[in-house]
Interface confidence: low
């Protein structure tokens, strides 16, 4: 073969030209329209897993490939028919027109064409196999897409039901909010009404207060007048008494002028015939200085001088050294009689000390010391106690041996703190010790876990603050 050329004609059909000597043979072959050229950009694995948006694209590609296969098959059949027809015609022509040696050439060309056809068929078979592989792969991908789609559909359904639930909840809440708004409006209206009523009430009260203020002014004036009248009356009474005593003395010279009786303690008051509980004026030993004290003439035989009382928290017991020295409070209520008086009194003769206690549960107890006295101020009113009996604990809640008295401004305790400041009140603090009857007064339900309350450890334990306490003294030989 001098020349064998493959080219394209103007209408795009493939033509095979064979040059043999002076003869050239041209074969026009039918062209496939839908055949993809080898250079077309096609990626076999272009379908992406779990990408439902490319599902339609994959189906379309599959259809295209099926069409290509069908067209290839048709083209092969056409090619075979075409070759057979041409061969018949050419063979007849060759037999008729050509010389004997041309027959050989034609047979060779025919063989050549058949070889080419076989080659083409093999190639197409390969293409078919590739297409089948690609089809299988696409089918698998389609299956994956199908599963992915199912999953997505399920999720969408779930989400839809969730959305429906939320919508229901939302509508329920909206209703609730509307109901609340209505309620709120009603409440606001009632509040406004109440406010108006209160304003009326306030204005009424203001007018009442004004009237009362006027009355108070008048009462104050009247009170001043009454006080003056009372003073004048007292003066008149005193004058009369003086006149009477003078006239009596003149009548009976044997009756000496009666000396005013003074009492050192409530035991003396009791012995003098005053057996009623109350406030009496007592006189310091070896002095004319007086002090008012409450006398208990009923408890345990009477004659008790009350030196301390707590009952309602009405008196502040966080006082100075001087205040504890001279006494403070109200003898008919909460009070401290005074360390100086008690010290002088208890150093004159032997006294007993009774401490009466009440808790918040209605229980009562007492501690009785058979000997009690306080040292002088120079020794910081140190407490001395002996012989404990009673129901408020077998161990003394006042530390033994006795300690010096301490106040917020007189720190004489055995502590590296200031017990009086920490626990409040003046007391015979140790470090700081198991008692403090002058601590903070705590009302009921606030009286537990209080380290600075009214404490008597060996009766009520740690942190319990008592309801009421009374400290009373009486001569041991009463």
């Amino acid at each position: 073969y001098n020349n064998f050329r493959k080219s394209m004609d103007s209408i795009g059909k493939k033509q095979y030209q064979v040059q043999h000597g002076s003869c050239s043979y041209t074969f026009l072959l039918p062209e496939m329209d839908n055949c993809r050229s080898s250079s077309s950009p096609y990626v076999s694995n272009a379908v992406q897993r779990d990408a439902p948006l490319e599902y339609d694209d994959s189906v379309q590609r599959l259809q295209v490939l099926e069409n290509i296969m069908e067209n290839n098959t048709q083209w092969l059949m056409k090619l075979e028919n075409y070759i057979q027809d041409n061969m018949k015609k050419e063979m007849v022509e060759i037999q008729q027109n050509a010389v004997q040696n041309q027959t050989a050439v034609m047979i060779e060309i025919g063989t050549n064409l058949l070889n080419q056809t076989a080659e083409q068929t093999r190639k197409l078979t390969d293409v078919e196999a590739q297409v089948l592989n690609q089809t299988t792969r696409l089918e698998l991908q389609l299956l994956e897409h199908s599963l992915s789609t199912n999953k997505l559909e399920k999720q969408i359904l779930d989400q839809t039901s969730e959305i429906n639930k939320l919508q229901d909840k939302n509508s329920f809440l909206e209703k609730k909010v509307l109901a609340m708004e209505d309620k709120h409006i009603i409440q606001l209206q009632s509040i406004k009404e109440e406010k108006d009523q209160l304003q009326v009430l306030v204005s009424k009260q203001n007018s009442i207060i004004e009237e009362l203020e006027k009355k108070i002014v008048t009462a104050t004036v009247n009170n001043s007048v009454l006080q003056k009248q009372q003073h004048d009356l007292m003066e008149t009474v005193n004058n009369l008494l003086t006149m009477m005593s003078t006239s009596n003395s003149a009548k009976d010279p044997t009756v000496a002028k009666e000396e005013q009786i003074s009492f050192r303690d409530c035991a003396e008051v009791f012995k003098s015939g005053h057996t009623t509980n109350g406030i009496y004026t007592l006189t310091f030993p070896n002095s004319t200085e007086e002090i008012k004290a409450y006398c208990d003439m009923e408890a345990g035989g009477g004659g008790w001088t009350i030196i301390q009382r707590r009952e309602d928290g009405s008196v502040d017991f966080q006082r100075t050294w001087k205040e504890y020295k001279v006494g403070f409070g109200n003898p008919s209520g909460e009070y401290w009689l005074g360390n100086e008086f008690v010290s002088q009194l208890t150093n004159q003769q032997r006294y007993v000390l009774k401490i009466h206690l009440k808790d918040w549960e209605g229980n009562e107890a007492y501690s009785l010391y058979e000997h009690f006295y306080l040292s002088s101020e120079e020794l910081n009113y140190r407490i001395h106690l002996k012989g404990l009996t009673g129901t408020a604990g077998k161990i003394s809640s006042i530390s033994q041996p006795g300690n010096d008295f301490s106040t917020k401004d007189g720190d004489n305790d055995k502590c590296i703190c200031k017990c009086s400041q920490m626990l409040t009140g003046g007391w015979w603090f140790d470090a700081c010790g198991p008692s403090n009857l002058n601590g903070m007064y705590y009302p009921q339900r606030q009286n537990t876990n209080k380290f600075n309350g009214i404490k008597w450890y060996y009766w009520k334990g740690s942190g319990y603050s008592l309801k009421a306490t009374t400290m009373m003294i009486r001569p041991a030989d009463f």
Epitope: S399, C415, I416, C417, Q421, D430, A431, C432, F451, G463
Partner: antibody, heavy 121, light 107 residues
Framework: QVQLVESGGGVVQPGRSLRLSCAAS????????MHWVRQAPGKGLEWVAV????????YYADSVKGRFTISRDNSKNTLYLQMNSLRAEDTAVYYC??????????????WGQGTTVTVSS | DIQMTQSPSSLSASVGDRVTITCRAS??????LGWYQQKPGKAPKRLIY???SLQSGVPSRFSGSGSGTEFTLTISSLQPEDFATYYC?????????FGQGTKVEIK
């Protein structure tokens, strides 16, 4: 709750210094006396120093007098022990302790977990 | 300085035993004495204050007695958790002083 936490321990050469700290929480630190107590390895407890609630008074064991200084910062709720001229015999676990307690001031009631001081060359 | 002498320095006992530890002060300290329990690697824990007052939360099998110079700590019925070292402390004056300790071991 009431808590004391010591810090500042470590290994130090003889003659050198160290400062221990004790952080207090859960109680009114400024109202209570504070102590340092130590325990040498395998030995008993030894009281070291005390400082009054307001820092006005300080006492020391004879073994540390002139070398150790106890101090406090009530604004920081912290107790300190400045240890100078350290000796091998100062090797111990150092505890800070407070006089806080139920019927407090009856000796040390609240203790820290301790910090170890080792004096070695 | 007040010296505190504790005895014995160690003792072996069984669970359920009654144990007594004594502490002697070199001078009178009223009732200004506390008893402490210490377990290995732990901080001391106060059992008794004011010689005979039981610290809150401490079992009643522990008790203290004495005044002046002679003091006693008693464990009425020893329990497994009671095996530890016990110290007395005087807080009557500074410097405060501990006893040398009593180690209670299992027999």
């Amino acid at each position: 709750q009431v808590q004391l936490v010591e810090s500042g321990g470590g290994v130090v050469q003889p003659g050198r210094s160290l400062r221990l700290s004790c952080a207090a929480s859960g109680f009114t630190f400024s109202s209570f006396g504070m102590h340092w107590v130590r325990q040498a390895p395998g030995k008993g407890l030894e009281w070291v120093a005390v400082i009054w609630f307001d820092g006005s008074n300080k006492y020391y064991a004879d073994s540390v007098k002139g070398r150790f200084t106890i101090s406090r910062d009530n604004s920081k709720n912290t107790l300190y022990l400045q240890m100078n001229s350290l000796r091998a015999e100062d090797t111990a676990v150092y505890y800070c302790a407070s006089d806080y307690g139920d019927y407090f001031y009856y000796g040390m009631d609240v203790w820290g977990q301790g910090t170890t001081v080792t004096v070695s060359s | 300085d007040i010296q505190m002498t504790q005895s014995p320095s160690s003792l072996s006992a069984s669970v359920g035993d009654r144990v007594t530890i004594t502490c002697r002060a070199s001078q009178g300290i009223r009732n200004d004495l506390g008893w402490y329990q210490q377990k290995p690697g732990k901080a001391p824990k106060r059992l008794i204050y004011a010689a005979s007052s039981l610290q809150s939360g401490v079992p009643s099998r522990f008790s203290g007695s004495g005044s002046g110079t002679e003091f006693t700590l008693t464990i009425s019925s020893l329990q497994p958790e009671d095996f530890a070292t016990y110290y007395c402390l005087q807080y009557n004056s500074y410097p405060r002083t501990f006893g040398q300790g009593t180690k209670v071991e299992i027999k």
